[in-house]
């Protein structure tokens, strides 16, 4: 029950996180005009990953897309790439995790297969969250660098009395959305990985029953049945010819691969 709850909660948290990553990527307010210590302008500038916008105090807003690829800063391209990779991994992770949910029955899919899918989706969510956090952090670092550079030459003199005001940009709402969403996706991924450990069925080891035949002493020990997962060979039923039954202490316990997660 706890495993199902952990898996379900992990899925929901990751779903919210990925929705947030998508929202952050699409938002225009990655950087916004810094209003502190600046002359009050009747124009407010803000920029996203895909376009820059200007909102006038009249209420008129105009946005212009970045219609060039080669002309954009490498850092911006890197942030775009990280966010897209995060979204793609997250979307695949969501798809995999839907089929992995313990509460959803799909044919005769065994728990071990669900455990593997849960682990896979968990890892995908973790990487997705890390991509989003990295992307947002790179952009934030870029903003901080540019902010202090523009503060150093806040007013550039132009022929005596005439001055040009340098527009400074600070953190926009999308950065906070991205950080929170990345964190949620990461947490959801960790929860999925934790749930995976509890999903895998442990080996059922039966006590050996000994049959004393004339002339030979043969013991049959049925092994645990486990579906093939691709992560290792199946533990098949093994006939053990050792001239007698094993004691309880001698019964071999086969470690599950999930013990190493």
């Amino acid at each position: 029950m706890a495993v199902t709850a952990c898996q379900g909660l992990g899925f929901v948290v990751s779903l919210i996180g990925i929705a947030g990553i998508i929202a952050a990527t699409c938002m225009d307010q990655w950087s916004t005009q810094d209003l502190y210590n600046n002359p009050v302008t009747a124009v407010f500038n803000y920029q996203g990953l895909w376009r820059s916008c200007v909102r006038e105090s009249s209420g008129f807003t105009e946005c212009r897309g970045y219609f060039t690829l080669l002309g954009l800063p490498a850092m911006l391209q890197a942030v775009r790439a990280l966010m897209i990779v995060g979204i793609v991994l997250g979307a695949i992770g969501l798809l995999v995790s839907i089929f992995a949910l313990k509460c959803i029955r799909i044919g005769s899919m065994e728990d071990s297969a669900k455990a593997n899918m849960t682990l896979t989706s968990g890892i995908m969510f973790i990487v997705s969250g890390l991509c989003a956090i990295a992307g947002v952090s790179v952009f934030a670092n870029m903003l901080v660098t540019n902010f202090w550079m523009s503060t150093a030459n806040m007013y550039t003199g132009m022929g005596g009395m005439v001055q040009t005001v340098q527009t400074r940009y600070t953190f926009g709402a999308a950065l906070f959305v991205g950080w929170v969403a990345g964190g949620l996706t990461l947490i959801g991924g960790v929860m999925m990985c934790i749930a995976c450990r509890g999903l895998a069925p442990e080996e059922t080891n039966y006590k050996a029953v000994s049959y004393h035949a004339s002339g030979h002493s043969v013991a049959y020990k049925p092994g645990g049945f486990k579906a093939s997962t691709g992560f290792g060979s199946n533990t098949k039923n093994k006939k053990i010819y050792d001239g007698g039954a094993r004691t309880e202490d001698e019964v071999q316990s086969y470690p599950s691969k999930h013990d190493y997660v």
Epitope: T41, A42, V54, E56, S57, G59, V162
Partner: antibody, heavy 118, light 113 residues
Framework: EVQLVESGGGLVKPGGSLRLSCAAS????????VSWVRQAPGKRLEWVAT????????YYLDSVRGRFTISRDNAKNSLYLQMNSLRAEDTAVYYC???????????WGQGTSVTVSS | DIVMTQSPSSLSVSPGERVTISCKSS????????????LTWYQQKPGQPPKLLIY???TRESGVPDRFSGSGSGTDFTLTISSFQAEDVAVYYC?????????FGAGTKLELK
């Protein structure tokens, strides 16, 4: 047709108060930023205050800040300017205007005259 | 506050003549976000409220005759009337629409010669 009609002007003693009103029609008032601009006899135009749409940010000329209050009632399509502690230098024709692209003032009322004199 | 300096203060013009009015601002009115200059030109005829002519320094308001044009960037701007008409007799104002307080120039009075 866009129309802005000011009212509430008149003669008032220094230190007195007056409330100007502007009735708007012919456009979506709630979506528009609106301003008051004044013009003293024979002088240049002087912007007084602006109130934006939506969250209604307000901006004032330094010499009127604290004395004048711009407000709006979107339900009544009306703009107001509450003027307190009036001075002789506030004597002017007060125009109600709508802000347009580029923050330009595209529609103006006919104006209402305010005279501050003892 | 931004100081708007207009010149000349007055001008006598003959019909058909080309007129240029200059406006200088104490700070750049160019917004880096959209590369637009927040300068507006108005025409005010005697006894009337002002009328919007040009916004964003060079965009003509609808219904304004094409003999009116605006140009300039940053701090230096110009209003040009390519062929002055008798009905153009008025006072012309430039306005800073970028910084609060929104400030107007002192105006240029155009008279018929």
């Amino acid at each position: 047709e866009v129309q802005l009609v000011e009212s509430g002007g008149g003669l008032v003693k220094p230190g007195g108060s007056l409330r100007l009103s502007c009735a708007a029609s012919g456009f979506t008032f709630s979506n528009s930023a609106v301003s008051w601009v004044r013009q003293a006899p024979g002088k240049r135009l002087e912007w007084v205050a602006t109130i934006t749409s939506g969250v209604s940010y307000t901006y004032y000329l330094d010499s009127v800040r604290g004395r004048f209050t711009i407000s709006r009632d979107n339900a009544k399509n009306s703009l107001y300017l509450q003027m307190n502690s009036l001075r002789a230098e506030d004597t002017a024709v007060y125009y109600c205007t709508r802000q347009f692209k580029g923050n330009a003032l595209d529609y103006w009322g006919q104006g209402t005259s305010v005279t501050v004199s003892s | 506050d931004i100081v708007m300096t207009q010149s000349p203060s007055s001008l006598s013009v003959s019909p058909g003549e080309r007129v240029t009015i200059s406006c200088k601002s104490s700070q750049s009115l160019l917004n880096s976000g959209n590369q637009k200059n927040y300068l507006t030109w108005y025409q005010q005829k005697p006894g009337q409220p002002p009328k919007l002519l040009i916004y964003w320094a060079s965009t003509r308001e609808s219904g304004v005759p094409d003999r009116f044009s605006g140009s300039g960037s940053g701090t230096d701007f110009t209003l040009t009337i390519s062929s002055f008409q008798a009905e153009d007799v008025a006072v012309y104002y430039c306005q800073n629409d970028y910084f609060y307080p929104l400030t107007f120039g002192a105006g240029t009075k155009l008279e018929l010669k």
